[in-house]
Amino acid sequence: SIPWNLERITPPRYRADEYQPPDGGSLVEVYLLDTSIQSDHREIEGRVMVTDFENVPEEDGTRFHRQASKCDSHGTHLAGVVSGRDAGVAKGASMRSLRVLNCQGKGTVSGTLIGLEFIRKSQLVQPVGPLVVLLPLAGGYSRVLNAACQRLARAGVVLVTAAGNFRDDACLYSPASAPEVITVGATNAQDQPVTLGTLGTNFGRCVDLFAPGEDIIGASSDCSTCFVSQSGTSQAAAHVAGIAAMMLSAEPELTLAELRQRLIHFSAKDVINEAWFPEDQRVLTPNLVAALPPSTHGAGWQLFCRTVWSAHSGPTRMATAIARCAPDEELLSCSSFSRSGKRRGERMEAQGGKLVCRAHNAFGGEGVYAIARCCLLPQANCSVHTAPPAEASMGTRVHCHQQGHVLTGCSSHWEVEDLGTHKPPVLRPRGQPNQCVGHREASIHASCCHAPGLECKVKEHGIPAPQGQVTVACEEGWTLTGCSALPGTSHVLGAYAVDNTCVVRSRDVSTTGSTSEEAVTAVAICCRSRHLAQASQELQ
Amino acid sequence: QEDEDGDYEELVLALRSEEDGLAEAPEHGTTATFHRCAKDPWRLPGTYVVVLKEETHLSQSERTARRLQAQAARRGYLTKILHVFHGLLPGFLVKMSGDLLELALKLPHVDYIEEDSSVFAQ
């Protein structure tokens, strides 16, 4: 029967008694930077080309005995998970292996850098189809390793890495912390985060998604027909590398940003038990388990968006946090969140010719997060319209006044330390849909975009008094681009998007002593692209 | 872009006085930074990745590496250039004493220096 991990990543329409998805990734080359591998293992023979690249440190210990099967163990298993004949994800993908880890599974940042450079030079000398680079390794945070990954990603290479097995914030490790890399955490057959001894999978905002990573059957270097079960975020990353290979084989022109958005979009949502993660990391960690798309073509019509959390601002009075989208993504909205509730909102601002989302801490606050909603919107022309604090009783408002521009997000930012002491308007008159409305003491920022066929609508859900959280979701066929809270009072901790749901968090009414007058409303802006839908229909 | 003393020969460098003066200072007064792994057991002191500014050419990288070697030799230190990077990042990998970091950070074109560290199979 089909191994649990292959079943988990397979959409129901492919599930027969065996795993045989349509395209095995045959147009894609997957580079594996790992230990040496047994390339003639029955499971992978002819699929893996062992390059002559080797850069490894000497093994520790004077009595270390180099046993070939042990030296090859990690890499052979991963090659099998990516492209193995019987237990592999992308059975048609061809692989190239570089040895950067020694027989004890240890390497260096410098060796990895030289390996990445080798791949780039190979790509320049002999350009092939799409390239996926699998980095099933982790070290401490490294500026230079992250920079090298960024350069390779900008050269059109898809990098996939293990989040790390340290039961820790993945942002403290490299290459897991590199924003351009697809960072993968590990889950088990019960969709729980994987525990590995006293440790386990890493988590946090630097993880893009999770994938099967416990008891994964794959090629064993013990013999040419042997299989073995291994666990770790390397195994999880290998699944995503395989899925990426299959997606790229079906659509070779996909950019890294498009691929990442598709991986997120087709993942199983909200199946991981978040209680396993430290409380402060739960909101930051994506509840996504990787899966193959139900059909290899035809996802192009969708408006894809993802949520990007910033690093924590830190607690100083003027501290700010910045969340950035990838180069070919559009920032369609910006929100902020603070566990203490002490924040001064957020604003979208230009930085280096690109919009970023900046959140502001408030005096006495423990710090804030900026949350960017990053979307794929071809031929988009977006701008930010700002209205300064109105000071008048009806609140501040701003709308998209340019012809053909639609509202995709609202942000508000205030200078006063605590909006809660400044009574908000009791009534909020309904304006036109292209309008942001906010507290009279706040400046309001509207994200206005023009893109072919783009249409958006506002959806609200309010409750009379805060109860921890209010949510509002976009319906099928619409994508959440903006998420904000009304009003911006002190008991609102912030707003953020989780998949297609806008979540507004607030302090419980019992702890704040708020009145029902301070109703909290979650405001979602839901968009879709008629242009993308039409283009896709014309292709079919 | 080439720095004004980029064409100096190693021999000339070697003959200059101990107080190398302004020629060693990074251009535009920016200070290169040093980075190392926060996890102490994973550090590999003695090997450093010297990362040069983005537009640095391979020839400049090689020249900067030679300059470091020459200046280190004058101070009585042996250094070994293990690899010159180009294609992804400009720079070089050098085996040297940590005592030379201050000197290396002042070299022209240097953006930052990172001490090598371990990575592990996951």
């Epitope: 023979e45 019987d86 040419s224 | -």
Partner: antibody, heavy 115, light 109 residues
Framework: QVQLVQSGAEVKRPGASVKVSCKAS????????ISWVRQAPGQGLEWMGW????????NYAQKVQGRVTMTTDTSTSTVYMELRSLSSDDTAVYYC????????WGQGTTVTVSS | QSALTQPASVSGSPGQSITISCTGT?????????VSWYQQHPGKPPKLMIY???NRPSGVSIRFSGSKSGNTASLTISGLQAEDEADYFC?????????FGGGTKLTVL
């Protein structure tokens, strides 16, 4: 192009040994092992075993285990199959083939065991 | 006694389609994606026609196709031609080895 070239025909007495060679070329040798298959006159194919060119590991079929030895000489890209204690039942054409997938075959070596 | 069962012979007229079956168990054909089919003309080494159940090596005519259902694999040859007359063998992985079928003689009438 990918080629497997085998040694010439052999005639052996019962109880003797035979050593057949197979020289590989045209591909990355370590990416594939070599399988040995035999075919008795008018009969089907029988898999005898496999050897790794990468590390010399072997996997022998139960039927010939103990009588067969497969070896490699990486310097000459040649693989050898030695079969001992021959009997008339071992009269067959012996083929080497690339890997377990057996996508490329040698031309075959006829081994005749006769007293 | 071969581990995989094939019909001893099949025949068909030029232009027709024929199918050769190869039956094993869940420990071989049913358990692996690696069923291969070989064509062998008299006095020649076998030639790989289908690998991994349904894949054709480059250079093999699209008239040859493979499939599998449960523990039985099949080779179908459409638009039968005189040069297709040969012996056909299936093979499959087992947990530690390889097994062949007894072979099927295809006669083109």
């Amino acid at each position: 192009q990918v080629q497997l070239v085998q040694s010439g025909a052999e005639v052996k007495r019962p109880g003797a040994s035979v050593k057949v060679s197979c020289k590989a070329s045209g591909y990355t040798l370590t990416s594939y092992g070599i399988s040995w298959v035999r075919q008795a006159p008018g009969q089907g194919l029988e898999w005898m075993g496999w050897i790794s060119v990468y590390n010399g590991n072997t996997n022998y079929a139960q039927k010939v285990q103990g009588r067969v030895t497969m070896t490699t000489d990486t310097s000459t890209s040649t693989v050898y199959m030695e079969l001992r204690s021959l009997s008339s039942d071992d009269t067959a054409v012996y083929y080497c083939a690339r890997g377990y997938g057996m996508d490329v075959w040698g031309q075959g070596t006829t081994v005749t065991v006769s007293s | 006694q071969s581990a995989l069962t094939q019909p001893a012979s099949v025949s068909g007229s030029p232009g027709q389609s024929i199918t050769i079956s190869c039956t094993g168990t869940s420990s071989d054909v049913g358990g692996y994606n690696s069923v291969s089919w070989y064509q062998q003309h008299p006095g020649k080494p076998p030639k790989l026609m289908i690998y991994e159940v349904s894949n054709r090596p480059s250079g093999v005519s699209i008239r040859f196709s493979g499939s599998k259902s449960g523990n039985t694999a099949s080779l179908t040859i459409s638009g039968l031609q005189a040069e297709d007359e040969a012996d056909y063998f299936c093979s499959s992985y087992t947990s530690t080895s390889m097994v062949f079928g007894g072979g099927t003689k295809l006669t083109v009438l």
